[in-house]
Amino acid sequence: SIPIPQKLFGEVTSPLFPKPYPNNFETTTVITVPTGYRVKLVFQQFDLEPSEGCFYDYVKISADKKSLGRFCGQLGSPLGNPPGKKEFMSQGNKMLLTFHTDFSNEENGTIMFYKGFLAYYQAVDLDECASRSKSGEEDPQPQCQHLCHNYVGGYFCSCRPGYELQEDTHSCQAECSSELYTEASGYISSLEYPRSYPPDLRCNYSIRVERGLTLHLKFLEPFDIDDHQQVHCPYDQLQIYANGKNIGEFCGKQRPPDLDTSSNAVDLLFFTDESGDSRGWKLRYTTEIIKCPQPKTLDEFTIIQNLQPQYQFRDYFIATCKQGYQLIEGNQVLHSFTAVCQDDGTWHRAMPRCKIKDCGQPRNLPNGDFRYTTTMGVNTYKARIQYYCHEPYYKMQTRAGSRESEQGVYTCTAQGIWKNEQKGEKIPRCLPVCGKPVNPVEQRQRIIGGQKAKMGNFPWQVFTNIHGRGGGALLGDRWILTAAHTLYPKEHEAQSNASLDVFLGHTNVEELMKLGNHPIRRVSVHPDYRQDESYNFEGDIALLELENSVTLGPNLLPICLPDNDTFYDLGLMGYVSGFGVMEEKIAHDLRFVRLPVANPQACENWLRGKNRMDVFSQNMFCAGHPSLKQDACQGDSGGVFAVRDPNTDRWVATGIVSWGIGCSRGYGFYTKVLNYVDWIKKEMEEED
């Protein structure tokens, strides 16, 4: 058996239930619920060995020192006494369940298996106020002398008006010296009315209702107070005071007139002498309510909700504004307005005005601006603005399926918020436009040995100075694509704390320096890059995140990323730009070369012919030609192989200058950017 804590419900089962119960077993489970509750027990399943008088195996239920029955068998068994769905109820908060089994479960020599029982119990409120005398049960509690009030888990006593509950919390004694009535209406009577009132009373019945109400008194029949034919009320008297002023003294059998006290405070004083058997008095008091003037609006935009024909004390009205207007009280903006009719017949606050909603100055759009399509500078309800991006360097981010006409259009709403149909309160984003140089490089001439770049030819070009010169390309407005080996060169130790100096926006090194370096927030090197493997440039790709976004312009624009393999077609011409070595001298200006994508097999053969051990993998491509005297050179590392996409007229970074750089001596090897696009996007997304 399990100890049953004082819970409000639970279950009791035979041991091992629903498996057969053991022989030679007896235990008592004490089910206890909190004081003030009774226990109700019902069997859900019952399967015990049947016997005459339940002598062998049985469940005995008892409570309040009484047995509630002894049970065995199962539904439908000819022998035994199953409990069925009977509800067992205790009077107190305890119930005992004794389960007894004998030495065997046998029937005609066959061993039988009985499952036992499953019972549920619950705490049920004990109504201590219900009369118990009928059932002949002894009441553990003394009864209330006057009134009994049951609540879940207990009870309490109270007394009729004019009596006081004594210390024993059950008995009552006459005490009417300070009876207070605060309800808006009710009945008041002398003690024991309409039976004779007790002697020697000094009763004071006070009626106190809210100001704004006036009390009316109406006496009922019978009215009967001891009096004398010659002397006015010498024995017992009922005196009535309103606002402290005596408005009458009554006795005899003549009912007083209906009284309008014009007051919210009335006292009834009832004095009796030591004798008499008059029946007393009873009155009904009611209240009437004061009225307030009809509310009137101060402007055409104010609305009084559900206007009533009249308003009395405690009534209220709610004022709102027409759409696009807001409530103003003095200089204060209100979210709501309620006026309450006061006890003196005035409204507790003055009528507000309604003023048009103001959305305030529209938010500034980074890399863009806005113009008013309604009156310039007016930011009130129904005003409209159009956000736009600084083109051609930025373009507004569009949602799939959004209407062109609604793009960037924001309206001042009735809520006082600038809102767009699609984006809601969010302002648009101006996204960098990639691969659209304002001054693209001329592609017609064939250049041998490279050439000086003009401003705006390669606006994505980044000049890095980390372990010496290097290059990179701008992606978006805060990312730089470069080679991993510019950050972690092969001949250096793994722990490199070189300063990361990055310059953008010019073709001249000196001018770049003047423009100042861009601090780096984060460096992300591809996990496949191995600094310690000299001949393996696998994963030679890295991203630098700038601390601050750059402002794009004609000399500073990002390059696009490739989206298909056609960018690596044999013979496709691309451009490599950089500030690297040129004819064994460090360049002061950005230079570029135009190179064809080479045949991977030819590059492989060329490498082997030179007895080089370098890894040339699927994640690389080669460009140039052994016979061409043009190639990238030291200092160009990390720069990109840029190809113009004829379909979109956009420039795409298909490669990163990686290795095999011999300065016009054979093929150059590039990281194949297409294979790393997913990694690049993931890295860039993580920070967005």
Partner: antibody, heavy 114, light 111 residues
Framework: QEQLKESGGGLVTPGGTLTLTCTAS????????MSWVRQAPGKGLDWIGI?????SAYYATWAKGRFTISKTSTTVDLKITSPTTEDTATYFC??????????WGPGTLVTVSS | AQVLTQTPFSVSAAVGGTVTINCQAS??????LAWYQQKPGQPPKLLIY???DLASGVPSRFKGSGSGKQFTLTISGVQCDDAATYFC?????????????FGGGTKVEIK
């Protein structure tokens, strides 16, 4: 034959601790509620408490805090904490069956003396 | 608190006679009462349970009766072996723990 036997009695000094043990033969202790009763020399029977098969113990009001009933699969123990000379008595264990106690052990005498 | 009062305190009977022992409960206990016999130096022995049911191996000269508050143990055809102290006990031990469940005892002497 169903039998009970108490052990662990003897002389104990006031304020000490003593544990009495009840063992059964012929039936399993884990199948019945077990009770402890004591009898001072020449006096009547005093019920101390009972433990049911689930391990819930119930005590006479006077015994609460002074006595602890516990059980294992083979024994029922009565721990007497800080005994006084008034606790000198023969202590019986009994099996509760049909709201009565049957069988009883022969008892074990506990003498509290300094 | 539930109290069991046994009367008489002691009784003397002749062999072959009848002894009647009373047990009165301060509150109704239904038929939940047992009777025991205890001889000096021995533990109590169950005679009657549930007010009137004879325990296994107990001679039929022992008879229990009563319910509610008033109970009686009758020994008819008293024998020498019946000299002992007899105790009554109520079975409501789980819900009247504020009192002793045993009566004070009645000593029976055989003349």
């Amino acid at each position: 034959q169903e039998q009970l036997k108490e052990s662990g009695g003897g002389l104990v000094t006031p304020g000490g601790t003593l544990t009495l043990t009840c063992t059964a033969s012929g039936f399993s202790l884990s199948s019945y509620d077990m009770s402890w009763v004591r009898q001072a020399p020449g006096k009547g029977l005093d019920w101390i408490g009972i433990i049911n098969t689930g391990g819930s113990a119930y005590y006479a009001t006077w015994a609460k805090g002074r006595f602890t009933i516990s059980k294992t699969s083979t024994t029922v123990d009565l721990k007497i904490t800080s005994p006084t000379t008034e606790d000198t008595a023969t202590y019986f264990c009994g099996r509760k069956i049909n709201d009565a106690f049957d069988p009883w052990g022969p008892g074990t005498l506990v003498t509290v003396s300094s | 608190a539930q109290v069991l009062t046994q009367t008489p305190f002691s009784v003397s009977a002749a062999v072959g006679g009848t002894v009647t022992i009373n047990c009165q409960a301060s509150e109704s206990i239904s038929s939940n009462l047992a009777w025991y016999q205890q001889k000096p130096g021995q533990p109590p022995k169950l005679l009657i349970y549930d007010a009137s049911d004879l325990a296994s191996g107990v001679p039929s000269r022992f008879k229990g009766s009563g319910s509610g508050k008033q109970f009686t143990l009758t020994i008819s055809g008293v024998q020498c072996d019946d000299a002992a102290t007899y105790f009554c006990q109520h079975g409501w031990i789980y819900d009247t723990i504020d009192s002793n469940c045993f009566g004070g005892g009645t000593k029976v002497e055989i003349k």
